[in-house]
């Protein structure tokens, strides 16, 4: 990212390019790869965010058991379409003409099949289970500090709504944090939770998408939180569909 | 004051390759995007794509994927637009401008003329 | 990509007269700040003006006859009194997303 002028950058999306040709002259900052302007006081959606990643010049626990029907990103990296808002297209189709569904993560919902692939609706995933794992430490985190701090920096840093952080479960050495968020629930302004788990998981892998913060310092009353883990389950309102063969692999 | 200055006229054969150039003054270079545009003989406007000189970002009308290429050279102000393989239909007037949408200022066009 | 459709493709009015041309996108290119749509004169012979930027937002130097409005999907040019200056093509053009493409362009003549 290069800053067009004092001050015309993004604060929220380093995966821009800002320049001083906006309405009245002011900055405006566009998205790499799609072109598309970003508001920087919010977080980018993941779909704009992948698309310029793409395009850049590179038993009784207290801990949740994901559901059959939750998804793991297995796929990768891939250069999605995005609608006129920023957030993924229901199909998403690569170079070779293979096609899938995905849902409001991008993270794909169904076999892939041929240009002939039907994708009625972008189905929202309406709960994320984040699963940690910290590095050893001397003892145990006190867990309503870990839960404090958790909640605290989803609030702050990714801006996103108390009320969307249903639970933080702690059972050393593993976190998981629940977010959960229905369509109904979200109202025009709020962030979405998938685009928040998204920023997170990058902070986590020291890849924050911040403009020059530092990386994410995680400390629970002083003591260093380092992940050496991630895992992220994602739950969809209506289930995916996958033939019997996948689900038997 | 603000200016673009592109490079003069080309006639090429088809096949071949052509370089525009556009030298930009009166402003710093490096803070706007440059954006590229042609326009067929009697014909409306066409995107092509657009750079960012101080990084070098670009963007490309996928019609001009694989063909066009913008490149900028920072310490002389002047973006370049080549377009390779050129075919009788590329015959048009090739405008730099200064901004993404919205070129506010323009330079004063290129004629590319492709014949045998 | 995103196709833009101006109407009329000429239109012939008299001197003083007020001169509307219209341009659709084929999806909305607003937020609820901005419109991401622009509008240029070209004279035959010479390059694209900038006339307005972000819809209605004049640009510096051009005469105060001409205005922008719309939002959405739906934006008008208006020239209030026409002059015989103003005799040109005048085109639109969206900075939504990639390819920022223009209208086909509305030829504007003196009756």
């Known amino acids: 990212h290069t800053a067009a002028q004092d001050n015309c950058t993004c604060p929220t999306n380093k995966m821009t390019v800002c320049s001083p040709d906006g309405p009245g002259g002011r900055c405006q900052c566009r998205a790499l790869g799609s072109g598309m302007a970003v508001d920087c006081s919010t977080l980018t959606s993941k779909c704009l965010l992948l698309k310029a990643r793409m395009s850049a010049p590179k038993n009784a626990r207290t801990l949740v058991r994901p559901s059959e029907h939750a998804l793991v990103d297995n796929d990768g990296l891939y250069d999605p379409d995005c609608d006129p808002e920023g957030r993924f297209k229901a199909r998403q189709c690569n170079q070779t003409s293979v096609c899938w569904c995905v849902n409001s993560v991008g993270v794909r919902r169904t076999d892939k099949g041929d240009l002939s692939l039907r994708c009625d609706e972008l189905v929202r995933t309406h709960h994320i289970l984040i699963d940690l794992r910290h590095r050893p430490t001397a003892g145990a985190f006190n867990h309503s500090d870990l839960d404090a701090e958790l909640r605290r920096l989803f609030r702050e840093r990714y801006r996103l709504h108390p009320k969307f952080v249903a639970a933080v479960h702690y059972e050393q050495p593993t976190i998981q944090i629940e977010l959960r968020q229905n369509t109904s629930q979200k109202a025009a302004g709020d962030v979405d939770i998938g685009d928040a788990a998204y920023y997170f998981e990058r902070d986590i892998k020291g890849e924050s998408l911040f403009q020059g913060r530092g990386g994410l310092d995680l400390r629970v009353r002083g003591e260093p939180l380092q992940v050496e883990r991630t895992l992220i389950y994602y739950l969809d309102e209506i289930p995916p569909k996958f033939s019997m063969k996948r689900l038997t692999a | 004051q603000v200016q673009l200055v592109q490079s003069g006229a080309e006639v090429k054969k088809p096949g071949a390759s052509v370089k525009v150039s556009c030298k930009a003054s009166g402003y710093t270079f490096t803070n706007y995007w440059i954006g590229w545009v042609r326009q067929a003989p009697g014909q409306g406007l066409e995107w092509i794509g657009d750079?960012?000189?101080?990084?070098?970002?670009?963007n490309y009308n996928e019609k001009f994927k694989g063909r066009a290429t913008l490149t900028a050279d920072t310490s002389t102000s002047t973006a370049y637009m080549e377009l390779s393989s050129l075919r009788s239909e590329d015959t048009a007037v090739y405008y730099c401008?200064?901004?993404?949408?919205?070129?506010?200022?323009w330079g004063q066009g290129t004629l590319v003329t492709v014949s045998s | 990509d995103i196709v833009m459709t101006q109407s009329p493709d000429s239109l012939a009015v008299s001197l003083g007269e007020r001169a509307t041309i219209n341009c659709r996108a084929s999806q909305s290119v607003s937020t609820s700040s901005y419109s991401y749509m622009h509008w240029y004169q070209q004279k035959p012979g010479q390059p694209p003006k900038l006339l307005i930027k972000y819809a209605s937002n004049l640009e510096s130097g051009v005469p105060d006859r001409f205005s922008g409005s719309g939002s959405g999907t739906d934006f008008t040019l208006t020239i209030s009194s026409l002059q015989a200056e103003d005799v040109a093509v005048y085109y639109c053009q969206h900075s939504w997303e990639i390819p920022y493409t223009f209208g086909q362009g509305t030829k504007l003549e003196i009756k």
């Open positions: 750079i960012y000189p101080g990084g070098g970002y670009t």
């Open positions: 401008a200064r901004g993404t949408g919205g070129g506010d200022y």
